[in-house]
């Protein structure tokens, strides 16, 4: 499974698109900054076996895809960039699904560490709650865009684990 290579490229493309999606200066939104409690320890791949790393990566990307597929998101971003970004995420999800199938000898490995998956889900729940409380304002979306860039950057740590354990 050549996930590490394809996923790194896809992740880089997603980050570039997310950067291009910025519509307002982050400096004008400093008052809206928020600590979402990114579960950084969940991206320390040393605690994971390969399938579990794949599973956490998928969770991160699926939740990001969910977030950017809402009607509120459609209203907030430039459509062609949003579509390209979403397509990139979808492609990564497909790659990760295929990887589970292609990996030999992973059958007895648990697919997940439930605590890690729940930590990622709660993180995205906090993001969704923040957007709701801020009534999906342009600054709120800008803060979230910056946060997702940060979380996608962190997910590269998990990709390194996959590369190391190939």
């Amino acid at each position: 499974c050549d996930l590490p290579q394809t996923h790194s490229l896809g992740n880089r493309r997603a980050l570039i698109l997310l950067a291009q999606m910025g519509r307002i200066s982050p400096f004008s939104c400093l008052k809206d900054r928020h600590d979402f409690g990114l579960p950084q320890e969940e991206f320390d791949g040393n605690q994971f076996q390969k399938t579990q790393a794949i599973s956490v990566l998928h969770e991160m990307i699926q939740q990001t895809f969910n977030l950017f597929s809402t009607e509120d998101s459609s209203a907030a971003w430039e459509q062609s960039l949003l579509e390209k970004f979403s397509t990139e995420l979808y492609q990564q999800l497909n790659n990760l699904e295929a990887c589970v199938i292609q990996e030999v000898g992973m059958e007895e490995t648990p697919l997940m560490n439930e605590d890690s998956i729940l930590a990622v889900r709660k993180y995205f729940q906090r993001i969704t709650l923040y957007l709701t409380e801020k009534k999906y304002s342009p600054c709120a979306w800008e803060v979230v865009r910056a946060e997702i860039m940060r979380s996608l950057s962190f997910s590269t740590n998990l990709q390194k684990i996959l590369r190391r354990k190939d």
Epitope: T51, H58, T87, N94, E97, E107, L111, M112, L118
Partner: antibody, heavy 126, light 110 residues
């Protein structure tokens, strides 16, 4: 919880087309695929294809390519199945089905059907 | 293309007995992507087991799934009257996404 509501029963002539709709309500996400699965009388289940409403991306089973079109609206979240060049053997109950966003981990979510419509009977008869 | 073959076609048992249903794949299937459904007459299928062995919400613990590679089983430890139905196994393969169902096993009252 997701509810899937399909359109009513149809009677069609051989060679014609049918369009079945499936409206989703509840905790829906356009970022999860909606599939169509059919069941001929007294027979098993057969996956026909799926659509990802968020992007309009479709995947079709080999058996139906060239005859099947799946489309979707994002608001309200609705999927449509169109099957053309109908034959007698297309007489079946057509189900729409979707994964669950609650399945942990999400990587299993799209590999299964957690929610099913009530089914729409399509009868092909001359 | 993967073919799933379920056996037996029909299983005649009494309430209280145990049942073992088999699902055999024509090639290796990830157990993580193996799912079981129950369908009663006139009803839509219901998700029972996913990921090979995880029970769906509300499914009693008398249902269990197991197996790997090409051989998978659904076990019902003690049949209750409401368990009699047709059971289907289903696998997922990607890319491109393909969902395959077995032909079903009918568990009927003896």
């Amino acid at each position: 919880e997701v509810q899937l509501l399909e359109s009513g029963a149809e009677v069609k002539r051989p060679g014609s087309s049918v369009r079945v709709s499936c409206r989703a309500s509840g905790d829906t996400f356009s970022s999860y695929p909606i599939s169509w699965v059919r069941q001929a009388p007294g027979q098993g289940l057969e996956w026909m294809g799926r659509i990802l409403p968020a992007l309009g991306v479709t995947n079709y089973a080999q058996n139906f390519r060239g005859r099947i079109t799946i489309t979707a609206d994002k608001s309200p979240l609705t999927a449509y199945l169109e099957l053309s060049s109908l034959r007698f053997e297309d007489t079946a109950v057509y189900y729409c089905a979707s994964p669950s966003a609650d399945i942990i981990p999400s990587i299993l979510g799209t590999t299964l059907f957690a929610f099913w419509g009530q089914g729409s009977l399509v009868t092909v008869s001359s | 293309e993967i073919v799933l073959t379920q056996s037996p076609g029909t299983l005649s048992l009494s309430p209280g007995e145990g049942a073992t249903l088999s699902c055999r794949a024509s090639q290796n299937v990830s157990r993580h992507y193996l799912t079981w459904y129950q369908q009663k007459p006139g009803q839509s299928p219901r998700l029972l087991i996913y990921g090979g062995s995880s029970r769906a919400t509300g499914v009693p613990d008398r249902f269990s799934g197991g197996g790997s590679g090409t051989d998978f089983t659904l076990t019902i430890s003690r049949l209750e009257p409401e368990d009699f139905a047709v059971f289907y196994c289903q696998s997922y393969h990607s890319p491109p996404p393909v969902y395959t169902f077995g032909q079903g096993t009918k568990v009927e009252i003896k």
